[in-house]
Interface confidence: low
C-alpha cells in the first residue's frame, strides 16, 4: 500500500521531503545511493576545483556542463567543464552559464528572451531516483500545450528561468521547479564543488546576482564541512 511504501526502509536514504509518493496506490520510490542533501553542503569539503567525470549535464554544478575536455576528444571521457559566458559559442542550453541560454549557437541572456512562443526542447526531469518517477514512468515536462503568457511570479511553477519574471530564476523546490529570487549580496547561496550536488538536490537556490559570487562566509571558515554557509559576495 501507499502507506507501507512511505514507511518502508527503501526510502530511508532520501533527503526530505522525498519520503512521499505520488497519489497512485502501489507506487514506490527507490533511493539513490549517495544522494545529496539540499544545498549540497553535506559533501562540500574544499573550494578548489577538481575535474569530475560525468555522463550528463545533470551530474555537474549549476555553472558547469558535461563534455569532452578536448575538441573532438574521446566521447567516452567526459568531465564537468566551466559554463560558457554570454556571447560564447554553445550547442545546448546547459553549456551556458546561469541566466543565459543557447540560441543559434550563441549563449544569450535569458533577460533578452521576454517571451519565446516555442519551447526549444522537452526537459527530462531528474528526481534523484535514477531518472524514474514515482509511478515508474519517465516524466517529460513540456509547456507546448500551455504556454506562459505572463511571466511567473515568485513561487509559481516554471520550466526554465525565462518563464519567470525579472529578478527570478527557475529552481527546483521538492519535485517541482518554481520561480525563486536571484540572490542578493549577503544572502545564503549554494556552492557546488561538482554537480552531483546540483542534479540531485531537492531544493535549489538561484544563482547570485550580477557582480556577486558564491563564497564561504568569512566567520564560518572554522565550522564543520556540513554546516558551512556560503553567501553571495562582491567579486
Amino acid at each position: 500500500t501507499l502507506n507501507s511504501v512511505l514507511n518502508s526502509n527503501a526510502i530511508k536514504n532520501l533527503p526530505p521531503p522525498l519520503g512521499g509518493a505520488a497519489g497512485h496506490p502501489g507506487s514506490a520510490v527507490s533511493a539513490a545511493p549517495g544522494i545529496l542533501y539540499p544545498g549540497g553542503n553535506k559533501y562540500q569539503t574544499i573550494d578548489n576545483y577538481q575535474p569530475y567525470p560525468c555522463a550528463e549535464d545533470e551530474e555537474c554544478g549549476t555553472d558547469e556542463y558535461c563534455a569532452s575536455p578536448t575538441r573532438g576528444g574521446d566521447a567516452g571521457v567526459q568531465i564537468c567543464l566551466a559554463c560558457r559566458k554570454r556571447r560564447k559559442r554553445c550547442m545546448r542550453h546547459a553549456m551556458c552559464c546561469p541566466g543565459n541560454y543557447c540560441k543559434n549557437g550563441i549563449c544569450v541572456s535569458s533577460d533578452q528572451n521576454h517571451f519565446r512562443g516555442e519551447i526549444e526542447e522537452t526537459i527530462t526531469e531528474s528526481f534523484g531516483n535514477d531518472h524514474s518517477t514515482l509511478d515508474g514512468y519517465s516524466r517529460r515536462t513540456t509547456l507546448s500545450s500551455k504556454m506562459y503568457h505572463t511571466k511567473g511570479q515568485e513561487g509559481s511553477v516554471c520550466l526554465r528561468s525565462s518563464d519567470c519574471a525579472s529578478g527570478l530564476c527557475c529552481a527546483r523546490h521538492f519535485w517541482s521547479k518554481i520561480c525563486k529570487p536571484v540572490l542578493k549580496e549577503g544572502q545564503v547561496c549554494t556552492k557546488h564543488r561538482r554537480k552531483g550536488s546540483h542534479g540531485l538536490e531537492i531544493f535549489q537556490r538561484c544563482y547570485c546576482g550580477e557582480g556577486l559570487s558564491c563564497r564561504i562566509q568569512k566567520d564560518h571558515h572554522q565550522a564543520s564541512n556540513s554546516s558551512r554557509l556560503h553567501t553571495c559576495q562582491r567579486h
Partner: antibody, heavy 118, light 111 residues
Framework: QVQLVESGGGLVQPGGSLRLSCAAS????????MSWVRQAPGKGLEWVSS??????????WYAAGVKGRFTISRDNSKNTLYLQMNSLRAEDTAVYYC?????????WGQGTLVTVSS | DIALTQPASVSGSPGQSITISCTGT?????????VSWYQQHPGKAPKLMIY???NRPSGVSNRFSGSKSGNTASLTISGLQAEDEADYYC???????????FGGGTKLTVL
C-alpha cells in the same frame, strides 16, 4: 491579492470523519503546491500534509501521525484544496490552516477549528 | 513528536534588539540551509518573515534578519517595536517520516 479561506471544521466524535476545504483566490492555484498545517489550542504549529501541482503528478506527503487516516487532494477547476480526515482522535483537535507553499509557507488562511470530543 | 527547540519566551524593550534561537539536529535544521521564521499574533494566521536562513519576503521589515551556524538558527529583531510582540516559529526540513518540522514557538514580549 492572495486569499485562502478554510471551511468544514466543527465538532466530531472520536472515530468520526470530517472534510476540510480551502478556497483559494488571487493567484494561479494550479501552479502552486499547497499544504495543511495545524495548531492545537495553546500549542505550536504542526505540519500535516502537502500536495504538489498537476505538473508534478500531485505528489503528496503526510506527517507520520496522520498517515493512513488523512487524505489531501485538490480540485484545480474549483481552486480548492481538501483534507479528508478519518478515524479522528482527540489529539487531532486543532485549528487547521491551509497554506500556499511557494517558497515555504508564504500565505495562510485564517484557519478552521476541528474539535474531536465525545 | 519531532520539533525544533526554541526558548519559550524572550522579552525586550522598545528600540532594543533581541535574538530568538532555534536548535535542531544534523537530521533536520543542521543538515539543510533552509530555515524559515514565522510571526503569529494572537488569533491570527502565521506570517512568513524569513526564508532560506536569511532572506526576507517583500513587505517584511529589514529589522528582521536570520542566520544559522551548525545546528542552530537565529532570528534577530532590531529596533524592537510594540507590534513585534507575537509568537515566533522556526521551520526546517527533516529526514525520516516528518518532512517539515516547526519549532515549539517563542513568545516575544515587548516591555
Amino acid at each position: 491579492q492572495v486569499q485562502l479561506v478554510e471551511s468544514g471544521g466543527g465538532l466530531v466524535q472520536p472515530g468520526g470523519s470530517l472534510r476540510l476545504s480551502c478556497a483559494a483566490s488571487g493567484f494561479t492555484f494550479s501552479s502552486y503546491w499547497m499544504s495543511w498545517v495545524r495548531q492545537a489550542p495553546g500549542k505550536g504549529l504542526e505540519w500535516v500534509s502537502s500536495i504538489e501541482h498537476k505538473d508534478a503528478g500531485y505528489t503528496t506527503w503526510y506527517a507520520a501521525g496522520v498517515k493512513g487516516r488523512f487524505t489531501i487532494s485538490r480540485d484545480n477547476s474549483k481552486n480548492t484544496l481538501y483534507l479528508q480526515m478519518n478515524s479522528l482522535r482527540a489529539e487531532d483537535t486543532a485549528v487547521y490552516y491551509c497554506a500556499r507553499h511557494g517558497i515555504d509557507f508564504d500565505h495562510w488562511g485564517q484557519g478552521t477549528l476541528v474539535t474531536v470530543s465525545s | 513528536d519531532i520539533a525544533l527547540t526554541q526558548p519559550a519566551s524572550v522579552s525586550g524593550s522598545p528600540g532594543q534588539s533581541i535574538t530568538i534561537s532555534c536548535t535542531g539536529t544534523s537530521s533536520d535544521l543542521g543538515g539543510y540551509n533552509y530555515v524559515s521564521w514565522y510571526q503569529q499574533h494572537p488569533g491570527k494566521a502565521p506570517k512568513l518573515m524569513i526564508y532560506d536562513v536569511n532572506n526576507r519576503p517583500s513587505g517584511v521589515s529589514n529589522r528582521f534578519s536570520g542566520s544559522k551556524s551548525g545546528n542552530t538558527a537565529s532570528l534577530t529583531i532590531s529596533g524592537l517595536q510594540a507590534e513585534d510582540e507575537a509568537d515566533y516559529y522556526c521551520q526546517s526540513y527533516a529526514s525520516g517520516n516528518t518532512k517539515v518540522v516547526f519549532g515549539g514557538g517563542t513568545k516575544l514580549t515587548v516591555l
